[in-house]
Interface confidence: low
């Protein structure tokens, strides 16, 4: 009696069970009563990642440099290319179909978290006692110079954008 279900890694066709093609191979001919399933390996730039009966392999995803992407992991006959953003960019979506440049933190703000391949730079305002005088995607807020530790007097207080300005101690306080 013809089978109604087949074992794992088999498929039912013409009332008989045929072997699926292994990952990295595509189906050319179904099996017959006297021949095994005929499979062929995927070509360069193609892949199939499961036991299958596909007649065409899938194309490797193209990591388009014009969209800011690069290959993080080259695809094989059983895996797809993995695209990530080039340095200095992050994904515009979870699928990472394109990338945009990282944002910089303006003067008065420091980097709280450096951007990754999937998230943008996170900035924070410089708290009292700290400053940032540059626009940067990497620099944190830096502490004001403590003039007294250098034996100097503070001539101008620091702000969120500028460091304290030190000068010579007045010998006589008038």
């Amino acid at each position: 009696e013809p089978p109604t279900a087949c074992r794992e890694k088999q498929y039912l066709i013409n009332s008989q069970c045929c072997s699926l093609c292994q990952p990295g191979w595509k189906l050319v001919n179904d099996c017959t009563e006297v021949t095994e399933t005929e499979c062929l390996p995927c070509g360069k730039g193609e892949f199939l990642d499961t036991w299958n009966r596909e007649t065409h392999c899938h194309q490797h995803k193209y990591c388009d440099p014009n969209l800011g992407l690069r290959v993080q992991q080259e695809g094989t006959s059983v895996t797809d290319n993995i695209c990530v953003c080039k340095e200095g960019r992050h994904c515009t979506s979870k699928a990472c179909e394109s990338c945009v440049l990282y944002h910089s933190c303006s003067p008065g703000f420091g980097v709280k978290q450096i951007a990754t391949g999937v998230s943008d730079t996170i900035c924070e305002p410089c708290p009292v006692g700290f400053f940032s005088n540059v626009s940067s995607a990497f620099e944190k807020c830096r502490p004001w110079t403590r003039c007294e530790t250098k034996g100097l007097a503070e001539q101008q207080a620091g702000t969120d954008k500028t460091d304290a300005v030190c000068g010579p101690q007045n010998r006589l306080r008038l």
Partner: antibody, heavy 120, light 112 residues
């Protein structure tokens, strides 16, 4: 700027082993594939091996397959070529080179090379 | 393996004159993304190779615009519009279409 400095070359007898190193600087080493290419004295360039950025994929030329192994240590920012069962025909200058990636596949920056001489 | 051939194997050029080197591959280097995986390198005397052209026609950064690459499939050409004394050396084409990557035999360019 990108810099690649090979070391470990020298004179070695046939059948012996040698390990070449390539110290990288000036770029994010862990983001790039890396190659070894060799050049026998007075001859042309011969591609030897390539390794993907995180070591999952490596390919070797048939002439060295089973004898040479390309590897990398991203924490040390260094590329290696372990050469076993050396033959006289392996005598060459060995260059390490960075792969340009999807936008420029193939070696884009090259080191100055290290000479390996296999002789009895 | 893909076999690369070059012609001529030797070339002597007058400064200021154009020069052209041909490279052929035994299989197509055109990939489904529309790019040709063919690079050109120059190895100056006593130096390491340097990339001139990648993906058939993309000039590498810092390469003078007198160098240009063209062609598709199996036939490629490197042109130097006006040869200068510093252009002497051996020019290699290389296919990056599939492993093993393979180089052409090289074309030695001298100045007359």
């Amino acid at each position: 700027q990108v810099q690649l400095v090979e070391s470990g070359g020298g004179v070695v007898q046939p059948g012996r082993s040698l390990r070449l190193s390539c110290a990288a600087s000036g770029f994010t080493f862990s983001s790039y594939g890396m190659h070894w290419v060799r050049q026998a004295p007075g001859k042309g360039l011969e591609w030897v091996a390539v390794i993907s950025y995180e070591e999952s994929n490596r390919y070797h030329a048939d002439s060295v397959k089973g004898r040479f192994t390309i590897s990398r240590d991203n924490s040390k920012i260094t590329l290696y070529l372990q050469m076993n069962s050396l033959r006289t025909e392996d005598t060459a200058v060995y260059y390490c080179a960075r792969d340009g990636g999807i936008a420029a596949p193939g070696p884009d920056y090259w080191g100055q090379g290290t000479l390996v001489t296999v002789s009895s | 393996d893909i076999v690369m051939t070059q012609s001529p194997l030797s070339l002597t050029v007058t400064p200021g004159e154009p020069a052209s080197i041909s490279c052929r591959s035994s299989q197509s280097l055109l990939y489904s993304n529309g790019y040709n995986y063919l690079d050109w390198y120059l190895q100056k005397p006593g130096q390491s190779p340097q990339v001139l052209i990648s993906l058939g026609s993309n000039r590498a950064s810092g390469v003078p615009d007198r160098f240009s690459g063209s062609g598709s499939g199996t036939d490629f050409t490197l042109k130097i519009s006006r040869v200068e004394a510093e252009d002497v050396g051996v020019y290699y084409c290389m296919q990056a279409r599939q492993t093993p990557f393979t180089f052409g035999p090289g074309t030695k360019v001298d100045i007359r």
